[in-house]
Interface confidence: medium
């Protein structure tokens, strides 16, 4: 399908102008490449009327142009001076008339209506409110006032100043006549439907003295605004319907083949399954605007949506509607990255998060997506640091790789964690997207130690336990603070090729702490990851606490060097705001062996990659 | 509409203190990272401090020890301490709320005039 895209459907009447927006994914060549608007023939072909390289045809001559807005990916063709004869099926297209790359426009140039002399013309869309201005002579004053509807040669009684209104106009319109010396009254239709359209005449007073008016009321379905955005993008439907309308159910639908709209999301808590985890209403503001944002775009999800307001929370005839006319674009600028990541209970995940490679130095965020009401994302972390604290020691949101992705880790994985997280920037809003995390069975690939008390003063040793398959991934561990996760120092240990035969005894990464100081309290990750690719982490608390009297201390090696498929997943955990953390004060006191003898080297904290029958409590 | 009203703003010689208030309407002042920027005369617009929903602050190096922010989220209120005031912190403060990239708000604008 053709990535190409513009109005369907164009009307307009003699003697006015048009201004017809084509789209176009704004690639270098795209941008650069010849636009043209062409007019279809009986043969098939299409005649260029109007190019981006300067040429009008006769027919446009002084009357039309075309221009290109390559920032934008747009182009807009003018004409002016329409003519009956303008009606007929055209093209926006780029590069070669014949290619392929453009959009069918439908232009159609009606005869404007034959209306009597002096008569008003009112233009309102559908649902707003008209106020017809009356006027009347003196001697009208005290008599009858009256609003009719002509259909046909025939004059239908709308509403009069004796209180007669008639039922297709029930609760939505009123006559107002003014204080004495004012000679005009007025009448107010509320809610317009689009069978209102047509011609009324006022009357005041009655025989060949009584005073008349013309009106006619044109009522128009809003015009769709043209939405343009990538697949896998974000869209936002910023929708103001007015104040008479502020405290009403709101709504976005889309309408359907049947011309009806589905209800995609309303104030009243419904939503469409097929946006779950991608999509919000945004709160309205005290005028009763608000706004939609829908992520993850799709090409199923093109169409045209309406937006208005209705107690039912859902489209009815006469209340105010806004339109948009949505296209994905499916050469999209937003790579793919997996929409949906699966973790393990007591595991981790890496999401990958694209944005606008343009903005490297945006503000980066992850939130959770939560359904109740119209939707909510609190944020759980931003690029300068986490935001909730019940995400303590678990959660960290890293700028690697860069040029266009960033990365989220969330370990200590339980089920409550499963849900839709949106990926944002404060930059580029059309590069928002969603990544649903989903809980399967299985076990973590990396194991450390439930929690360990260390020492002050003491060296500390974790092992961190990996199966064969990460054997040619990098390992690291770092220390878990609210900015981010600072790498430790590793050591070489043995030739480099310490994991190519991945036999049992060649599976841990272990970190040493020599001396444990006060500062070495907290959360140490051990992870695996190549390049700038982050894999599966493990975290483990780390207390310290003063050395006790000589003989009162425990050590327990076997929790310390845990066989490589042990399971040595922690169990206190704690609810708080509905998700499942770790909390290092609920832990069974446990400790890791410690090695009070000094550390050869000198560097306090290493990263140990060796052997578990080599594993020792000091570094070699 | 959405508002964002700064208050607080005035003359102060070199070595004071000021404190500049922001009030925000509560749906947008619950959900976002709400911070403060400045524009010194004949500058670009940057970055001071920021407090994110959770209570994260961040602060510009130049002003890191010296100014303060805090928010108080039952009157919807963001607060800007600034002490130990320099001629180079001259500039009009804006208010900022972000709402995670949803929305971006911004005040009119607060003039802090740092001179002796």
């Known amino acids: 399908k053709s990535p190409v895209f513009g109005p369907q459907e164009v009307s307009s009447v003699e003697g006015n102008s048009v201004s017809i927006k084509c789209y176009y994914p704004p690639t270098s060549v795209n941008r650069h490449t010849r636009k043209y608007w062409c007019r279809k023939g009986a043969s098939g072909r299409c005649i260029t009327l109007v190019s981006s390289e300067g040429y009008v045809s006769s027919n446009y001559a002084g009357r039309a142009n075309l221009t290109n807005f390559p920032e934008n990916g747009t182009f807009v063709v003018n004409i002016a001076q329409l003519s009956r004869d303008d009606s007929g099926h055209y093209k926006c297209g780029l590069g070669i008339n014949s290619r392929g790359l453009s959009f069918d426009v439908s232009l159609e140039v009606s005869q404007g209506p034959e209306l009597p002399n002096g008569t008003e013309v009112y233009t309102v869309d559908v649902g707003r409110t008209v106020t017809i201005k009356c006027p009347f002579k003196t001697e009208n004053a005290p008599k009858t006032k009256a609003l009719y509807k002509k259909i046909g040669q025939t004059s239908v009684l709308v509403i009069d100043s004796r209180n007669y209104v008639n039922p297709n106009y029930k609760d939505r319109i009123r006559l107002r006549i003014p204080g004495t010396g004012q000679l005009i009254f007025t009448v107010v239709i509320d809610r317009l439907r689009l069978s209102d359209h047509g011609l009324y005449l006022c009357q005041a007073g009655d025989g060949s003295n009584r005073d008349e008016k013309n009106a006619d009321l044109q009522v128009l379905e809003p015009e769709p605004e043209l939405v343009y955005e990538d697949l896998r993008g974000s869209v936002t439907f910023h929708c103001a319907l007015g104040l008479e309308v502020a405290n009403v159910a709101k709504f976005l639908c889309r309408v359907n083949s049947r011309e009806t709209c589905d209800v995609v999301i309303n104030t009243l808590g419904k939503r469409d399954s097929a946006f779950e985890g991608r999509i919000l209403l945004n709160p309205q503001d005290k005028d009763g605007s608000f706004s939609v944002v829908i992520t993850g775009l799709r090409k199923e999800d093109e169409g045209r949506y309406l937006c208005g307001a209705h107690s039912d929370g859902q489209l009815q005839e006469g209340w105010p509607i806004q339109a948009w006319q949505l296209f994905v674009n499916e050469e999209s600028t937003i790579p793919r990255s997996p929409t949906v990541v699966k973790g393990v209970a007591g595991g981790s995940v890496a999401v990958l998060c694209p944005y606008n490679p343009k903005e490297s130095q945006s503000l980066k965020y992850w939130c959770l997506w939560e359904g109740a009401q119209n939707g909510r994302c609190p944020l759980l972390v931003e690029s300068q640091g986490l935001v909730q604290e019940q995400y303590e020691g678990r959660l960290s949101l890293l700028q690697e790789p860069g040029n266009g992705t960033f990365t989220v880790i969330l370990n200590q994985l339980t089920t409550q964690d499963a849900g839709f997280y949106w990926c944002l920037t404060n930059g580029d809003t059309r590069w928002r997207t969603t990544v649903e995390i989903k809980i399967i069975e299985g076990e973590p690939n990396l194991k450390v130690p439930g929690n360990v008390t260390a020492v002050l003063g003491e060296t500390l040793n974790i092992p961190c336990h990996f199966p064969c398959k990460f054997s040619s991934y990098e390992k690291y561990w770092c220390k878990w603070s609210n900015t981010g996760c600072q790498t430790l120092p590793s050591q070489d240990e043995g030739p480099s090729e310490a994991f190519v035969n991945c036999d049992e005894n060649s599976r841990l990464v272990s970190l040493t702490l020599n001396p444990v100081t006060r500062a070495d309290e907290g959360w140490y990750w051990c992870g695996v990851k190549q390049g700038h690719f982050y894999g599966e982490t493990a975290a483990v608390y780390v207390a310290v606490e003063e050395k006790k009297v000589a003989g009162s201390r425990y050590v327990s090696p076997a929790k310390a060097d845990a066989a490589p498929d042990e399971k040595v997943l922690d169990s206190g955990v704690r609810e708080i705001e509905n998700k499942a953390i770790q909390d290092p004060r609920l832990f069974a006191e446990e400790k890791v062996v410690a090695d009070t003898g000094d550390q050869a080297g000198g560097s306090r904290a290493s990263v140990d990659s060796s052997s578990s029958e080599e594993q020792g409590g000091s570094s070699k | 509409q959405v508002q964002l009203v700064e208050s607080g703003g005035g003359l102060v010689q070199p070595g004071g203190s000021l404190r500049l208030s922001c009030a925000a309407s509560?749906?947008?002042?619950?959900?976002?990272?709400m911070g403060w920027y400045r524009q010194g005369p004949g500058k670009q617009r940057e970055f001071v401090a920021r407090?994110?929903?959770?209570?994260?602050?961040h602060y510009a190096d130049s002003v890191k020890g010296r100014f303060t922010i805090s928010k108080d989220n039952a009157k919807n209120t963001v607060t800007l301490q600034m002490n130990s005031l320099k001629p180079e912190d001259t500039a009009v403060y804006y208010c900022?709320?972000?709402?995670?990239?949803?929305?971006?708000?911004w005040g009119q604008g607060t003039l802090v005039t740092v001179s002796s």
């Open positions: 509560g749906s947008i002042f619950s959900a976002s990272v």
């Open positions: 407090i994110s929903p959770g209570g994260v602050t």
């Open positions: 900022n709320a972000d709402r995670f990239g949803f929305e971006v708000y």
